[in-house]
Interface confidence: low
């Protein structure tokens, strides 16, 4: 049998696994789709992105609201043509998430 | 131009983005490769998995050490033939990570 305490522990863990904004490491270059002769240092930044589990397999954890936060990064051209320049880079930061259908459903389905 | 304080902020962010064990939400059924008529509640658990950035594109963040932690979950069979049972499920937990080459290199390369 199982006691209340065990159920509480399981419930707490479940709450923590659910779809919500989570701090994630994203690669700036692929995020911005920059040309190959320009790269950023550091190459990655921490932002919040939607992640976690949904109750049903037909649902996916998606962002419902997004803000853009500015990160100071070095933009470097290859070959190095100048002192690396500090530039503000805007990166998407998910502020709200929801479990949504993976594809739009037919209105009659 | 940039001052020391700005560089310190960038440096701290970079440290946090680097390859290390990070709390991640994993789906138990796909983790254990269970049959489709058995599923778990909650379907997901939190464990540490290697994630983050590596300095070079040729490197990938990989686990170098793993422990297995036991999570108490409800195992449910479909169709429901009995009261859902609490079972201990062992899930891989990454305890060490390293940036390693994506594919083994030829000794002479």
């Amino acid at each position: 049998f199982y006691d209340i305490e065990t159920l509480k522990v399981i419930d707490e863990e479940w709450q923590r696994t659910q779809c919500s904004p989570r701090e994630t490491c994203v690669e700036v270059a692929s995020e911005l789709g920059k040309s190959t002769n320009t790269f950023f240092k550091p190459p990655c930044v921490n932002v919040f992105r939607c992640g976690g589990c949904c109750n049903e397999e037909s649902l996916i954890c998606m962002n419902t609201s997004t803000s853009y936060i500015s990160k100071q990064l070095f933009e470097i051209s290859v070959p190095l043509t100048s002192v690396p320049e500090l530039v503000p880079v805007k990166v998407a930061n998910h502020t709200g998430c929801k479990c949504l259908p993976t594809a739009p459903r037919h209105p009659y389905s | 131009f940039y001052d020391i304080e700005t560089l310190k902020v960038i440096d701290e962010e970079w440290q946090r983005t680097q390859c290390s064990p990070r709390e991640t939400c994993v789906e138990v059924a796909s983790e254990l490769g269970k049959s489709t008529n058995t599923f778990f509640k909650p379907p997901c658990v939190n464990v540490f998995r290697c994630g983050g950035c590596c300095n070079e594109e040729s490197l990938i963040c990989m686990n170098t050490s793993t422990s297995y932690i036991s999570k108490q979950l409800f195992e449910i069979s479909v169709p429901l033939t009995s009261v859902p049972e609490l079972v201990p499920v062992k899930v891989a937990n990454h305890t060490g990570c390293k940036c390693l080459p994506t594919a083994p290199r030829h000794p002479y390369s």
């Epitope: 070959p79 043509t81 100048s82 | 131009f1 020391i4």
Partner: antibody, heavy 117, light 112 residues
Framework: QVTLKESGPALVKPTQTLTLTCTFS??????????VGWIRQPPGKALEWLAN???????YYNPVLRSRLTISKDTSKNQVVLTMTNMDPVDTATYYC?????????WGEGTLVTVSS | DIVMTQTPLSLPVTPGEPASISCRSS???????????LHWYLQKPGQSPQLLIY???NRFSGVPDRFSGSGSGTDFTLKISRVEAEDVGVYFC?????????FGGGTKVEIK
Amino acid sequence: QVTLKESGPALVKPTQTLTLTCTFSGFSLSTYGMGVGWIRQPPGKALEWLANIWWNDDKYYNPVLRSRLTISKDTSKNQVVLTMTNMDPVDTATYYCVQVTNPFVFWGEGTLVTVSS
Amino acid sequence: DIVMTQTPLSLPVTPGEPASISCRSSQSLVHINGNTYLHWYLQKPGQSPQLLIYKVSNRFSGVPDRFSGSGSGTDFTLKISRVEAEDVGVYFCSQSTHVPWTFGGGTKVEIK
């Protein structure tokens, strides 16, 4: 507060190798994006950039002098060393150590190196 | 290499009067990222160079507002609206758009 100080011989003979040390404080060369470099100025003449070294050990040299220059760092000692081989009287100059930002904000006081037999 | 040509070589000035120094580069200093890395330094007698203006027209902190920078592409100017006795020294322009980073030959400003 950022400070940089150059040290090395005041006099070197032609064909000898010059070794200059830059000891700095107020920042760390292990900090992301940080660089230290060397610039020289012959008496009464223009400034000339020589070399610099970055936090990640990347090094850049003035192409004209590349074959004669070597720059290295000792992060734990907060030092950067520049060596210049085959010194000639035309290399007589004040050698400055700089913190490499865009532009150069912090400079050492400079050390005068005379090349003479 | 980018050649930086400064004029005049010497500039005798009267305190309270304006002064202007020109700097011309052998090639455009507009970087691929759109910035122009043209800077001005002042080297007072017996001292290291000190930054006055960065990226054409931005005054460095603590620099009096009588100093201003302007220009684009290959032609740049440093202006002192009213020269003071403490402004004497050698003024250098510098570019860090292209490697190797280069400096102008200098303009010596002295009081008449």
